[in-house]
């Protein structure tokens, strides 16, 4: 039946979708649909997403690109990756800050704010887990400090000060009277 060189295309497949009259090739990521194809299995007219907009996937029906999100400065967020035609801005926290989710069931798209990480050194404690997705986990007192209440107290520098049992164990002093 007529030596046709035309490609067969399946409207139900992933490659072509019915847009308007015909099954059309979709637009690649980073492009939006300006006009559908004008023949069966043809190429749609696709244009690159304008600045500050993006489309992350191949698409058949998007006639406009999505606006890039702005990181929330009020929540101390910063852009870890700038928006491109194919990917949205990736917001996060600057070094020394961690993500505190604003909802209980936290997922990647959940609203969040950035909190400064605990500085274990300033608390005279060992850093057990570095701060990234959650706050720093501080460990035991640094050498030359002992546990007293909630904090770490420095070992006395002379025998004149008092040195309780925990102090004595860490600092090597006996309580002097």
């Amino acid at each position: 039946q007529g030596g046709t060189r035309s490609p067969r295309c399946d409207c139900a497949g992933d490659f072509h979708k019915k847009i308007g009259l015909f099954c059309c090739r979709g637009c690649p990521a980073g492009h939006y649909l300006k006009a559908p194809c004008t023949e069966p299995c043809g190429n749609s007219t696709c244009l690159v997403c304008p600045q500050d907009t993006f489309l992350a996937w191949e698409n058949h029906h998007n006639s406009e690109c999505a606006r890039c999100q702005a990181c929330d400065e009020q929540a101390s967020q910063v852009a870890l990756e700038n928006c491109s035609a194919v990917a949205d801005t990736r917001c996060g926290c600057k070094p020394g800050w961690f993500v505190e989710c604003q909802v209980s069931q936290c997922v990647s798209s959940s609203p969040f704010y950035c909190q400064p990480c605990l500085d274990c050194g300033a608390l005279h404690r060992h850093t057990r887990l570095l701060c990234s997705r959650r706050d720093t986990d501080c460990g035991t007192c640094l050498p030359g400090f002992y546990e007293h209440g909630d904090g770490c107290v420095s070992c006395p520098t002379s025998t004149l000060g008092s040195c309780p049992e925990r102090c004595a164990a860490v600092c090597g002093w006996r309580q002097m009277f």
Epitope: Q1, G2, G3, T4, S6, R8, C11, K18, I19, G20, L21, F22, C23, P36, T38, E39, P40, C41, G42, H61
Partner: antibody
Framework: QVQLQQSGGGLVQPGGSLRLSCAAS????????MSWVRQAPGKGLEWVAT????????YFPDSVKDRFTISRDNARNSLYLQMNSLRAEDTAVYYC????????????????WGRGTLVTVSS | DVVMTQSPDSLAVSLGERATINCRAS??????????MQWYQQKPGQPPKLLIY???NVESGVPDRFSGSGSGTDFTLTISSLQAEDVVVYYC?????????FGGGTKVEIK
């Protein structure tokens, strides 16, 4: 039976506007692509516009693009052609037609036509 | 655009004789083994009427004296035995790609 009743033609000055209507009956209007075809006095047929079923994408030849718009109201079983910036060369009988799709080949033929409405563009 | 060229512009045939109208497309109008072209008949003061679709399929209600043939770029409409009511204008049209284009028409007359 399938019927396409046209209205809206008339005399208009160059640069003017006109809206043609086509009322459909006897078939499920929303399931068909629809077209407008024109015929200048004593001349042949020229395709003017098509609107798809479902997603209502519209298509035009370069001769009318940016001047004409095609639209449909599926609730009212009606097809429209809005013609702006009319020129003397737009003078013609305008026909609305139903586009029937044949099989899975994405192939359309105009199987039913309205009786036509005359548009005259003259000063 | 796909240019459709009809020949002849007019054709004089005796009643009861065969009439043959040709249509040539500037490029192939085939898709998936089907010729996306059709023939219309237009009587004076009336809209066109679909006679043949997909090059050779006769539309329902059309007398069987009408037939279509051809593929690729060359197509023919044949009226096997011309009747008085067939003495009108015939147009070919392609639907392979937009813009849809028509031939210039062939006027059939009685010899």
């Amino acid at each position: 039976q399938v019927q396409l009743q046209q209205s809206g033609g008339g005399l208009v000055q160059p640069g003017g506007s006109l809206r043609l209507s086509c009322a459909a009956s006897g078939f499920t209007f929303s399931s068909y692509a629809m077209s407008w075809v024109r015929q200048a006095p004593g001349k042949g047929l020229e395709w003017v516009a098509t609107i798809s079923d479902g997603d209502s994408y519209s298509y035009f030849p370069d001769s009318v693009k940016d001047r004409f718009t095609i639209s449909r109201d599926n609730a009212r079983n009606s097809l429209y052609l809005q013609m702006n910036s009319l020129r003397a060369e737009d003078t013609a009988v305008y026909y609305c037609a139903r586009d029937r799709i044949y099989g899975s080949v994405q192939y359309y033929a105009m199987d039913y036509w309205g009786r036509g409405t005359l548009v005259t563009v003259s000063s | 655009d796909v240019v459709m060229t009809q020949s002849p512009d007019s054709l004089a045939v005796s009643l009861g004789e065969r009439a043959t109208i040709n249509c040539r497309a500037s490029e192939s109008v085939e898709f998936s083994g089907t010729s996306l072209m059709q023939w219309y008949q237009q009587k004076p003061g009336q809209p066109p009427k679909l006679l043949i679709y997909a090059a050779s399929n006769v539309e329902s209600g059309v007398p069987d004296r009408f037939s279509g043939s051809g593929s690729g770029t060359d197509f023919t409409l044949t009226i096997s035995s011309l009747q008085a009511e067939d003495v009108v204008v015939y147009y070919c049209q392609q639907s392979r790609k937009l813009p849809y284009t028509f031939g210039g028409g062939t006027k059939v007359e009685i010899k």
